[in-house]
């Protein structure tokens, strides 16, 4: 529905929506009627793109046509002519203008000289009613250059190079109603320049270099309705009545300037103003009485400024206001009674504002509110009487569910089950792997414990998703601020960090043994246990520090429904941002680089030492197996961490990251390592396969009653498990020679390749 038709609809049928709506259908708080049928649906099912009512009523009138769009239809119905390529649509095709420059087009009394390389205003007969001189090379408007055009109603001067406008340039234009000066280089407008333009209704001076305006700038503009000064370089508005000479001004657009503050006297004469747009300025201070004179104001747009404090009674006189935009301001606090006086407000934008003290009381007095816009969809729960609340999701959660996507809701259980089962299975099976390298086994069990925590984290998230199913929005804010969320988030970080540090430790052990075999020193039991304890302590510290200082970290884990602090938001504390970057782009990136480099070096070292081997075909085959294994361990690491590094890096560059990313990362990417580590580090290794083989062999032997004296493990070649550290079968371990896998490097170079298969 266009804003025009909405306007007429309202004119004929009155308000297009009321809380009681329909045929006196009464719905309970948070529910809204389905048109004229008795059915009521909750807020979250209205305006969600799905016909939930069955008669489309829940998807009708969802557009926010409040504020300027209505005003535009009211006063400026022909707006789009202004932007059309050919601004004129004369009724008569033949030219009625006496003398026309050869390069210009003419229809009726309208002249089109666009893009004709004009350097000055052309001289034509005085009966012309519209003149378009867009996209030319005009630099100056000298005195009396339009003096004879008493009938001229529309003058288009956009996209020239105008720097100089004589104080007498527009003298004689007594019939002019629309003047377009956009996209020029005007730095200053002298008081009196518009003195003769008593009938001017539209003055558009967008995209120029104006740095200062004062009330006398507009002297003579008694009929002005629309004034657009978008995208100039105004740094302040005068501390004098701006509308002194524009008593009929309805619409003032000052978007995209550099205005720092608004003075008390500025709007004192603007009593007819209905739309005031001041978005994208640098306003940092507002006085209590700044907007007091604007009692007819219908829309106030203060979005994207630097406002930190709103005086409690700043909106008290805006009884007619229907649309208010305060989005993207660093507002610290909103008073509970801030909006009490805005009885006619229909649309309220608070996007990008962290409302720490949010409460239903703030919005309850706004009985006509039909559209509200927040930073977080969780805030929608505080405005249950508002039919359309955006956003209705943060990409992770929706109004109904903690996990918005059905895929995520299913896979959170699948992934957590795989992760938990895989790791628990390895923890239980490790003791059965006959290996003298108990220290290595201890590291792997430690790794599995860490990875298991990731599974537990996902189970908890899945559990709370189930708990809040269908009504998440009611609990969202409390959930994200809850101890549960903090703890489960720190569990995920603990798992991640311990896992990363353990993998790095294991990789470095292996790297030193293979690349520098003669420098390899056997890590004793004491050292290994110390390292493991240190890793876990580090993990705990990293995970729980944010919980220790709320002032510094704010709600570190509670920035989203899955309680995982992946990417920082603008409002997150600087401390939290730095901390998050230090973890993901500091510790974890460094660890990832070490792992990639180590496996690369190991493969290169093995490849070099194998060149001298005699059995070429065997060698190539084994090298391929080794390459495949190394590739998979690095590939899974990359699969897990590269997306996280990219997201973190982009968020650091202030790139807009969709909320959906976090949930997909948390459910599908982050657990990759946790789910696959058991497979890569245990289930696919030779000792494990041999153990399974042994179990199977023993089982069959028992069945055939012929198991006595059978060897269960007798590989045909000297084999050393190097995945991820060498694990020697006891039959091949010569205590005096091979007391620790590192010492395997004393074996001749030619047999080295066998070590990896």
């Amino acid at each position: 529905m266009t804003s025009g038709s909405v306007f007429f609809y309202i004119l004929i049928f009155g308000k297009y929506f009321s809380h009681g709506g329909g045929q006196d259908v009464k719905c309970s708080l948070g529910y809204f009627p389905c048109g004229n049928i008795t059915k009521c649906l909750p807020q979250l099912l209205h305006c969600n793109g799905v016909d939930d009512c069955g008669n489309q009523a829940d998807e009708d009138n969802c557009g926010d046509n409040n504020g300027w769009s209505l005003q535009f239809d009211k006063y400026f119905a022909s707006y789009y002519k202004m932007t059309s390529q050919y601004p004129f649509e004369a009724e008569t095709p033949e030219c009625l203008v006496g003398s026309v420059p050869v390069q210009c087009l003419c229809q009726g009394l309208e002249l089109d000289c666009d893009e004709t390389n004009l350097r000055a205003v052309p001289s034509v007969s005085s009966n012309v009613t519209a003149m378009s001189l867009q996209w030319n090379l005009i630099r100056k408007l000298p005195p009396d250059c339009f003096k004879n055009y008493h009938d001229l109603q529309k003058l288009y001067l956009q996209n020239n190079k105008i720097t100089s406008i004589s104080i007498y340039a527009f003298r004689g234009l007594n019939s002019l109603t629309k003047l377009y000066l956009s996209h020029n280089r005007i730095t200053f407008l002298k008081p009196g320049v518009f003195e003769d333009l008593h009938r001017l209704e539209w003055l558009i001076i967008e995209d120029n270099h104006l740095s200062r305006i004062s009330p006398p700038t507009f002297y003579g503009l008694n009929s002005l309705i629309l004034l657009v000064l978008m995208n100039n370089v105004l740094t302040r508005l005068p501390d004098k009545p701006l509308c002194q000479h524009m008593p009929r001004l309805h619409w003032l657009d000052l978007e995209g300037n550099h205005i720092h503050n608004l003075r008390n006297l500025t709007f004192i004469s603007c009593s007819n103003l209905t739309v005031l747009v001041m978005r994208k300025n640098k306003i940092n201070h507002l006085n209590e009485n700044t907007f007091a004179p604007l009692q007819k104001l219908d829309e106030l747009d203060l979005g994207s400024n630097k406002i930190e404090n709103l005086p409690p009674l700043i909106f008290k006189d805006l009884k007619e206001l229907s649309q208010l935009n305060l989005s993207y301001n660093p507002i610290q606090k909103i008073q509970a009674n801030q909006f009490d006086y805005l009885v006619k407000l229909k649309s309220l934008s608070l996007e990008g504002i962290e409302i720490s003290n949010i409460q239903q009381r703030m919005f309850r007095p706004l009985m006509n509110l039909s559209h509200i816009y927040f930073k977080k969809f969780q805030y929608c729960g505080y405005a249950p009487h508002v039919r359309s609340c955006k956003p209705n999701t943060d990409g992770i959660s929706s109004l109904e569910n903690l996990l918005a996507s059905i895929i995520q809701r299913v896979f959170v259980w699948v992934v957590s089950a795989v992760t938990c089962f895989g790791n628990i299975f390895v923890i239980c099976m490790r003791p059965y792997i006959r290996s003298e390298n108990k220290l290595y086994a201890m590291s792997i069990i430690s790794l599995c414990c860490a990875d298991c925590l990731m599974g537990i984290y996902l189970f908890v998230i899945g559990g709370f998703d189930l708990k809040f199913r269908g009504e998440y929005n009611k609990h969202a804010q409390l959930w994200m601020e809850s101890t549960h969320c903090q703890l489960v988030g720190s569990l995920a970080i603990l798992s991640t960090e311990v896992s990363v540090l353990l993998l790095t430790f294991l990789t470095l052990e292996k790297y030193i043994c293979i690349v520098y075999p003669f420098r390899c020193v056997r890590p004793g039991k004491c050292r290994t246990i110390t390292v493991l304890i240190l890793i876990w302590i580090t993990g705990f510290i990293v995970a729980f520090i944010p919980l220790s200082n709320k002032e510094f970290f704010k709600n570190y884990y509670g920035t989203n429904g899955v309680c995982f602090p992946l990417h920082s938001e603008d409002t997150e504390s600087i401390g939290a941002q730095i901390y998050s970057v230090a973890i993901f782009l500091g510790i974890n990136l460094a660890a990832f680089i070490i792992i990639v480099f180590s496996y690369g070096s190991m493969f290169y070292s093995v490849h070099q030492s194998a060149i001298t081997a005699t059995e070429i075909r065997n060698q190539v085959k084994k090298e391929m197996i080794l390459a495949k294994r190394f590739f998979f361990i690095v590939f899974t690491d990359a699969l897990c961490w590269i997306p996280i590094f990219v997201v973190k890096f982009l968020s650091l560059l202030q790139v807009e990251i969709p909320g959906t990313i976090t949930s997909w990362v948390v459910i599908f990417i982050l657990p990759i390592n946790s789910a696959l580590n058991p497979i890569l580090y245990t289930l696919t290794t030779r000792p494990f396969k041999e153990m399974i083989h042994r179990f199977w062999y023993n089982y069959r032997q028992r069945k055939s009653m012929d198991s006595k004296g059978q060897k269960t493990y007798a590989p045909s070649f000297i084999w050393v498990e190097m995945w991820p550290l060498q694990e020697m079968p006891p039959e091949l371990m010569k205590p005096d020679l091979f007391t620790y896998p590192c010492e395997m490097s004393l074996i001749s170079q030619s047999t080295r390749l066998n070590s990896y298969s």
Partner: antibody, heavy 122, light 107 residues
Framework: QVQLQQPGAELVRPGASVKLSCKAS????????MNWVKQRPGQGLEWIGM????????RLNQKFKDKATLTADKSSSTAYMQLSSPTSEDSAVYYC???????????????WGQGTSVTVSS | DIQMTQTTSSLSASLGDRVTISCRAS??????LNWYQQKPDGTVKLLIY???RLHSGVPSRFSGSGSGTDYSLTISNLEQEDVATYFC?????????FGAGTKLELK
């Protein structure tokens, strides 16, 4: 506060043009007209013309259109008036003065320089 | 051009006196009349603009009145520092024009 600084005196030979300066401070130089006023010894004030630094527009008294050229240097907030082919008739005190049009259409020359005494003599 | 006439070229008064200086325009100037004070050292100051509005920092003993073509400046309580020449100026149309000045002296 608004200040307009002019050199105290200039001695010129007849026929050799002279350029008088006026350095402005304490306000936005680009936003106001700069006026030049002549006062011959023991006589009244005569308006020569005015110049707007924002776009170099000038309005000259017809009487002085061949005598005075008005310019300005925005970067140094300095206004200039060049007198061509001076004669003894041009010996006078020349004032620069700011036109206040903040209350347009009420306009007044609100701040004046100390004046430069020009003596045309061979 | 609009001619501005100050009929009295000089006048003497005593300290504390009420002094009135008049000025006439050759045509209606719609109250666009300003008054200036020039001290003996040559410094010029704006006193009154738009017939009767006092410029900032000007003592309240100065006042202005008039309309159409006839205007006047009044000093209600003459002080030593008021010894100067006073000029009227019309700001209605260009070129701006000044009166010949009235020199105020102490008796």
């Amino acid at each position: 506060q608004v200040q307009l600084q002019q050199p105290g005196a200039e001695l010129v030979r007849p026929g050799a043009s002279v350029k008088l300066s006026c350095k402005a401070s304490g306000y936005s130089f680009n936003s106001y007209w700069m006026n030049w006023v002549k006062q011959r010894p023991g006589q009244g004030l005569e308006w020569i013309g005015m110049f707007h630094p924002s776009d170099s527009e000038s309005r000259l008294n017809q009487k002085f259109k061949d005598k005075a050229t008005l310019t300005a240097d925005k970067s140094s907030s300095t206004a200039y008036m060049q007198l061509s082919s001076p004669t003894s008739e041009d010996s006078a005190v020349y004032y620069c003065a700011r036109l206040d049009d903040d209350n347009y259409p009420l306009q007044s020359v609100d701040y004046w320089g100390q004046g430069t005494s020009v003596t045309v003599s061979s | 051009d609009i001619q501005m006439t100050q009929t009295t070229s000089s006048l003497s008064a005593s300290l504390g006196d009420r002094v009135t200086i008049s000025c006439r325009a050759s045509q209606d100037i719609s109250n666009h009349l300003n008054w200036y004070q020039q001290k003996p050292d040559g410094t010029v100051k704006l006193l009154i603009y738009y017939t009767s509005r006092l410029h900032s920092g000007v003592p309240s003993r100065f006042s202005g009145s008039g309309s159409g073509t006839d205007y006047s400046l009044t000093i209600s309580n003459l002080e030593q520092e008021d010894v100067a020449t006073y000029f009227c100026q019309q700001g209605n149309t260009l070129p701006l024009t000044f009166g010949a000045g009235t020199k105020l002296e102490l008796k």
